[in-house]
């Protein structure tokens, strides 16, 4: 660093800024000598409002440094980002956002739960709010699924009127025909492929309503579709295998007691969907009187042995192999309780007695021409077979 030149003025001795130090330290600094400033951990080099990664000044022949001394300013992570459906609390002190400050994110109680981490973030030396796991991204407030006002457990035929909060995942799909769906998370709707097939290239034509019991009520939460994803194995007009679709909403819906997503089945869910276990279907489809229901209806129906169901649909007019391993059947042998036209796409739900949450086991798909017919059953898409498909689409889009 020493370059000896005659007749050049030494530069003023560099006084390190607070929370910084000069390197190298010399007795004097003459032409072309230089020094750098290094800040303590948690402090950053700033020249005015502009940040610097490094700072080196060089002594000029007029005896001045070529740059003014920077400041070592305490790192300020700035106000933390707002957490959708959550809030943030300053732990260190009101509005304190500097190095080592702590904040705590939390989600709105009852309807949301925190994913990713515990919500505690610290302002680190790099200037980013960082979780104990090292994440710099926000935690996620995920809607709590499967909450219902019903504590026990459509094609709704022979059903009862639903009460507020009974089926908060119920979605009414208009645009072509009347169909149904079930809310997943806060921006997806699970439905039957055949119910939305005609709109697959015109997603915006789907009029999606939720948070209401009355089919014709003007009081509902409106949602619009951004995209429709139909299972690639579904072939329209060639049976109902893979009769499943997802609708991505263009905005997240606000979760409350009347709008809550249904849970997807856990791996262990099959134990709650054995033959004779009771599922509940809900919808605004045809009732025993032959008209679309005005009020949301529901029916509790038992799962039917798969072989028995397969046999029921082996005889004409049904083609052989109508009932596949991707379907489950539910209904009474004596008839009278069933889902019906207009219920398509709705969820057949079951109570997981371990988590005390409702999950979707089936999607209303097809059945006999005469709903509720004795010896015939409602056929539902078996959702558990499609968990990877659902998860892939939701994570990719």
């Amino acid at each position: 660093h020493h370059h000896h030149h005659h007749a050049s003025q030494p530069c003023p001795y560099p006084m390190a800024p607070p929370n910084g130090h000069v390197s190298p330290v010399q007795a004097k600094y003459i032409l072309k000598d230089s020094f750098s400033i290094f800040c303590e951990t948690g402090y950053e080099l700033l020249q005015g409002h502009l940040p610097l990664k490094s700072f080196t000044a060089v002594c000029q022949k007029d005896g001045s440094w070529d740059r003014p001394m920077p400041a070592c300013s305490i790192v300020d992570c700035g106000p933390p980002d707002d957490l959708p459906s959550g809030r943030v609390e300053y732990i260190t002190g009101p509005g304190v956002t500097t190095y080592k400050a702590v904040i705590q994110y939390s989600c709105e109680e009852t309807f949301y739960t925190m994913k990713v981490n515990d919500g505690k973030y610290v302002c680190e030396a790099d200037g980013f709010w960082t979780s104990s796991k090292g994440e710099k991204s926000l935690p996620v407030c995920e809607p709590v699924c499967g909450l219902s006002a019903r504590t026990t457990g459509g094609r709704i035929y022979g059903g009862q009127k639903a009460k507020p909060g009974d089926f908060p995942w119920q979605v009414l799909i208009l645009g072509g025909t009347t169909a149904a769906g079930a809310l997943l998370y806060d921006n997806w709707v699970l439905t039957a492929a055949h119910a939305v097939y005609e709109q697959k290239h015109d997603a915006s034509a789907l009029d999606i309503r939720m948070g209401t019991l009355k089919r014709l009520s003007p009081h509902y939460t409106q949602a619009w579709s951004e995209a429709v994803f139909i299972h690639e194995g579904y072939t329209h007009d060639a049976g109902f295998d893979n009769d499943i679709a997802l609708i991505k909403l263009n905005n997240k819906v606000v979760i409350n007691s009347n709008i809550t997503p249904i849970c997807l089945p856990r791996k262990e869910a099959e134990s709650f969907m054995r033959t004779d276990d009771i599922g509940t279907a809900s919808g605004w489809g045809l009732t025993q009187r032959g008209f679309l229901a005005r009020n949301l209806m529901y029916v509790d129906i038992p799962i039917v042995d798969h072989q028995k169901c397969t046999a029921a649909y082996e005889k004409p007019p049904y083609p052989r192999g109508s009932v596949t391993a991707n379907m489950l059947c539910a209904g009474l042998e004596s008839g009278g309780k069933d889902s019906c036209r207009g219920d398509a796409g709705g969820a057949l739900v079951f109570l997981d007695s371990e988590t005390e949450r409702w999950f979707v086991g089936g999607i209303v798909s097809w059945g006999s021409m005469n709903c509720g017919e004795a010896g015939q059953y409602g056929v539902y898409t078996k959702v558990i077979n499609y968990i990877p498909w659902i998860e892939n689409i939701i994570s990719d889009f």
């Epitope: 020249q47 005015g48 409002h49 502009l50 940040p51 990664k53 740059r67 003014p68 790099d126």
Partner: antibody
């Protein structure tokens, strides 16, 4: 030689979002400095919008903070501006720039003209 | 925010004339963090003076800058035709960074 080059759509409809890209050559955006977006209105008034620093931290003009996001792609040595809910008042020439930090190191792009109109 | 007021807004000078324009800050600015830019029509602004008084590379020595606190100025000792342009001051002492509205210098 350090060069900055803005690219963008030229025309945006009111209420839509504006996205601009600044491609930097001759210097890595992670090496040092703050990488700024500045705009110049038709009457020639200049407004600093915000920056993203070498470390990825951002600082925004409070007048734009609710609508503005500056991000980067270090693998492509690019940084980006996104301005939401644009109106005719956002019609301007948009520049990306490194502003001198008390040294003779100051570079601006050529600017990209944006018109907001239906 | 720190408002920078430039005056005059427009001025004209003859060849060889001494020219001074000012930049007044609404609150004190460190002289280290005040810049001047020159801009000609159709071009982006060019750094002209940094740290109040240091000339950017390629800037003729007839230009000078001075000032402290809230009062800054740019002076041309002898106007030349190529100096006709708009000059802007900029402070980056604190956020947000702010520019003056500019002084348009025309050749008389």
């Amino acid at each position: 030689d350090v060069q900055l080059q803005e690219s963008g759509p030229g025309l945006v409809r009111p209420s839509q979002s504006l996205s601009l890209t600044c491609t930097v050559t001759g210097y890595s955006i992670t090496s040092d400095y703050a990488w700024n977006w500045i705009r110049q209105f038709p009457g020639n008034k200049l407004e600093w919008m915000g920056y993203i620093s070498y470390s990825g931290r951002t600082s925004y003009n409070p007048s734009l903070k609710s609508r503005l996001s500056i991000t980067r792609d270090t693998s492509k040595n690019q940084f980006f501006l996104q301005l939401n809910s644009v109106s005719s008042a956002d019609t301007a020439t948009y520049y990306c720039a490194i502003i001198s930090t008390a040294v003779d190191f100051d570079y601006w792009g050529q600017g990209t003209t944006l018109t907001v109109s239906s | 925010q720190t408002v920078l007021t430039q005056s005059p807004a427009i001025m004209s000078a003859s060849l060889g004339e001494r020219v001074t324009m000012t930049c007044t800050a609404s609150s004190s600015v460190s002289s280290s963090y005040l810049l001047w830019y020159q801009q000609k029509p159709g071009s982006s602004p060019k750094l002209w003076i940094y740290s109040t008084s240091k000339l950017a590379s390629g800037v003729p020595v007839r230009f000078s800058g001075s000032g402290s606190g809230t009062s800054y100025s740019l002076t041309i000792s002898s106007m030349e035709a190529d100096d006709a342009a708009t000059y802007y001051c900029l402070q980056y002492n604190r956020s947000p960074l702010t520019f003056g509205a500019g002084t348009k210098l025309e050749l008389k």
